[in-house]
C-alpha cells in the first residue's frame, strides 16, 4: 500500500522537516527558516510559534517541531500549550477581577495560582485540630479527642496574630 501510495503521490516520500514543492516538480524542499513540518508528506511548512511579550522560549523551533513557550517570572501558563500567561499572586492570595486578594478567614492557598480553598474540617473525620490553619496553609488534623489518654492534650502552637485559626464548623 505504501509503495502504491508513493507511486501515486510523490509527496508521500517527503520526510518531516521538508515540504513537497509544487513549484519545483514536487521535489522535497527543506522548510524555510522559521518554519517546520512535524510529519511527512506535507505540502507546506507551518510558521514557527514566536514567544514574545510575556512569553519566553522554552524550546526553540526546529525544522521538525514547533517552538514551545512558557511565561516570564511573575506569570504562569494557562491553556493548552501555554496559550495565555496569567499573573501570579502570593501564597495566601487568589486572583480576582480586581487583582490579588488575601484569602478570606477559613480559607487558604499554598500556591501562587488558583483559588483559596476552605480549611479541612477535622471534626468531619472525628479528629481535632493539631495545627491551626493560616491563609497559606491548611489545618493539620490530629487524633480524635477520644484517642487522647486521660490528662494528655494535643499540642497547639501559638495562634497566628491575625487568626484564631480553628477549623470552620
Amino acid at each position: 500500500f505504501e509503495r502504491t501510495r508513493s507511486l501515486q503521490d510523490p509527496c508521500s516520500n517527503c520526510p518531516a522537516g521538508t515540504f513537497c514543492d509544487n513549484n519545483r516538480n514536487q521535489i522535497c524542499s527543506p522548510c524555510p527558516p522559521n518554519s517546520f513540518s512535524s510529519a511527512g508528506g506535507q505540502r507546506t511548512c507551518d510558521i514557527c510559534r514566536q514567544c514574545k511579550g510575556v512569553f519566553r522560549t522554552r524550546k526553540e523551533c526546529s525544522s521538525t517541531s514547533n517552538a514551545e513557550c512558557d511565561c516570564t517570572p511573575g506569570f504562569h501558563c494557562l491553556g493548552a500549550g501555554c496559550s495565555m500567561c496569567e499573573q501570579d499572586c502570593k501564597q495566601g492570595q487568589e486572583l480576582t477581577k480586581k487583582g490579588c486578594k488575601d484569602c478570606c478567614f477559613g480559607t487558604f492557598n499554598d500556591q501562587k495560582r488558583g483559588i483559596c480553598r476552605p480549611w479541612t474540617n477535622c471534626s468531619l473525620d472525628g479528629k481535632s485540630v493539631l495545627v491551626n490553619g493560616t491563609k497559606e496553609r491548611d489545618v493539620v488534623c490530629g487524633p480524635s479527642p477520644a484517642d487522647l489518654s486521660p490528662g494528655a492534650s494535643s499540642v497547639t502552637p501559638p495562634a497566628p496574630a491575625r487568626e484564631p485559626g480553628h477549623s470552620p464548623q
Epitope: C51, G53, V54, L78, S83, C85, E86, Q87, K98, G99
Partner: nanobody, 122 residues
Framework: QVQLQESGGGLVQPGGSLRLSCAAS????????IAWFRQAPGKEREWVSC????????YYADSVKGRFTVSRDNAKNTVDLQMNRLSPEDTAVYYC???????????????WGQGTQVTVSS
C-alpha cells in the same frame, strides 16, 4: 497600521523623575487595559503597572508602589507612567502592552510597543 509607541525615556539622576507615554495608532487605547513592563540588561521582562479599561483601576508591582503612577487620557489616546524617586535599579527598557482581556492575562497576539530606554545614573 496598528501599533503602540512609547516615548519619554532618557537619562535621569537618582531621585529624579520621568514621565513615560504610550500612544496608540490604528486603534483606541480606551478599549484596552494598558500595562507597563520593563526589562533590565540580562534580566527577564518584569510587569510594572497596569490600568484597566473599564474603571481605570490601577495596579502596581511592589517594587514601584508609591513611586510610580499610571493614568490614561482617552481623548489623547495615551497612557502615561509617572515615575518618581527613581533609583539605578529602575534602569531598563520600558514597554507598554495592550492585553485583550484584562490586566492579569496576556496572549501572544496582544499589542506591544518597541520600548523606550530609561537610565538612572549620576
Amino acid at each position: 497600521q496598528v501599533q503602540l509607541q512609547e516615548s519619554g525615556g532618557g537619562l535621569v539622576q537618582p531621585g529624579g523623575s520621568l514621565r513615560l507615554s504610550c500612544a496608540a495608532s490604528g486603534f483606541s487605547l480606551g478599549l484596552y487595559a494598558i500595562a507597563w513592563f520593563r526589562q533590565a540588561p540580562g534580566k527577564e521582562r518584569e510587569w510594572v503597572s497596569c490600568i484597566e479599561k473599564s474603571d481605570s483601576s490601577a495596579y502596581y508591582a511592589d517594587s514601584v508602589k508609591g513611586r510610580f503612577t499610571v493614568s490614561r487620557d482617552n481623548a489623547k489616546n495615551t497612557v502615561d507612567l509617572q515615575m518618581n524617586r527613581l533609583s539605578p535599579e529602575d534602569t531598563a527598557v520600558y514597554y507598554c502592552a495592550a492585553p485583550q482581556s484584562d490586566c492579569f492575562h496576556y496572549k501572544e497576539n496582544d499589542y506591544w510597543g518597541q520600548g523606550t530606554q530609561v537610565t538612572v545614573s549620576s
